[in-house]
């Protein structure tokens, strides 16, 4: 049997809505023929299901086999190194992969200007892998919230923060002109999920956007 292979040092999930990726770190001194076996356990079934016998990458997209994540008690995954006839012990994820582990994101943020207000519309994620009935708003049906960060250019680090409870929001610009840049981070008040800040969206506000009233 020769020398034992060491186990992958760490195994963990990183996930967004219907984008569930398993990661692991490589064993020390792996050879060109080293690969990794991935197995998955669904809570309630209690038997390990082999997903990949020999992955040469250090991550694996498990979305397709965890589509019921949002209606289940979650999963554990395990990974072991394989090199020819030798294999290591399994390294198991040390937390349960459940809906709570999914990082919340937004699809996009659209901005427009109306009478001195910036009107924002948050588009929710619409991943192709999601079953038709499993929309973001049906899974997270209550207590959706969004932190809004507003930056005025020039003045790179003058931030205003605001929390809103709807996908549509408005920002009063107090008559200021210039470029306003907005980022959004989603959360669900009743949950502990982390949120990822969106990419910045910017819009220019000039005098022409203000209505003159007598």
């Amino acid at each position: 049997h020769g020398t034992e292979l060491p186990s992958p040092p760490s195994v963990w999930f990183e996930a967004e809505f219907f984008h569930h990726i398993l990661h692991w770190t490589p064993i020390p001194n792996q050879s060109e023929s080293t690969c990794y076996e991935v197995a998955l356990l669904r809570y309630g079934i209690e038997s390990w299901n082999s997903i990949s016998n020999c992955s040469q990458t250090l991550s694996y997209d498990l979305t397709a086999v965890t589509l019921d994540l949002y209606h289940s008690n979650g999963y554990r995954a395990r990974v072991r190194a394989v090199d020819g006839s030798r294999h290591s012990n399994w390294t198991v994820t040390n937390t349960r992969f459940s809906v709570d582990e999914v990082t919340l994101t937004v699809g996009s943020v659209n901005l427009e200007i109306h009478n001195g207000f910036i009107l924002g519309k948050i588009q929710l994620p619409r991943p192709k892998m999601a079953p038709a009935n499993d929309t973001y708003e049906s899974i997270f049906s209550h207590f959706r919230e969004y932190e809004i960060a507003i930056r005025k250019v020039p003045g790179n680090f003058t931030f205003t923060h605001k929390k809103v409870k709807h996908e549509n929001f408005s920002l009063l610009t107090s008559g200021e002109v210039g470029e306003f840049c907005v980022q959004v981070k989603p959360s669900v008040a009743s949950r502990s999920n982390k949120g990822m800040w969106s990419k910045e969206e910017c819009i220019s506000l000039t005098r022409q956007y203000f209505t003159v009233t007598n």
Partner: nanobody, 124 residues
């Protein structure tokens, strides 16, 4: 907006050492991990090393394994790359990047924010 600022580059002799730093500034820092990439003159950008931001886990390119060490200070939102036993072929612009997608740590596409880069020259 998240901004990444690298420092610590410079001219060093073969066999020497440098420590690169990358400070993440801005009130909207969120990332799965952080990474270092490099681009040698006339070549494409290549992966050097990466680290999970929350939890344990590091990755290294084969060419730097055993010579480079990646580390982080979460309280300062700062990433480091200790580079020892430097070689002429390590000469490149080194970029810090924040991983904003759940995909592979080794892929540029997983990283949504990039620094401007710091030049490392290894020459006698």
């Amino acid at each position: 907006q998240l901004q990444l600022l690298e420092s610590g580059g410079g001219l060093v002799q073969p066999g020497g050492s440098l420590r690169l730093s990358c400070a993440a500034s801005g009130r909207t820092f969120s990332a799965y991990g952080m990474g270092w990439f490099r681009q040698a003159p006339g070549k494409g950008r290549e992966f050097v090393s990466a680290i999970r931001w929350y939890g344990e886990g590091t990755y290294y390119a084969e060419s730097v394994k055993g010579r480079f060490t990646i580390s982080k200070d979460n309280s300062k939102n700062t990433l480091y790359l200790q580079m020892n036993s430097l070689r002429a072929e390590d000469t490149a612009v080194y970029y810090c990047a924040a991983k904003t997608r759940p995909d592979s740590y080794l892929s540029e596409k997983s990283y949504g924010y990039w620094g401007q880069g710091t030049m490392v020259t290894v020459s006698s």
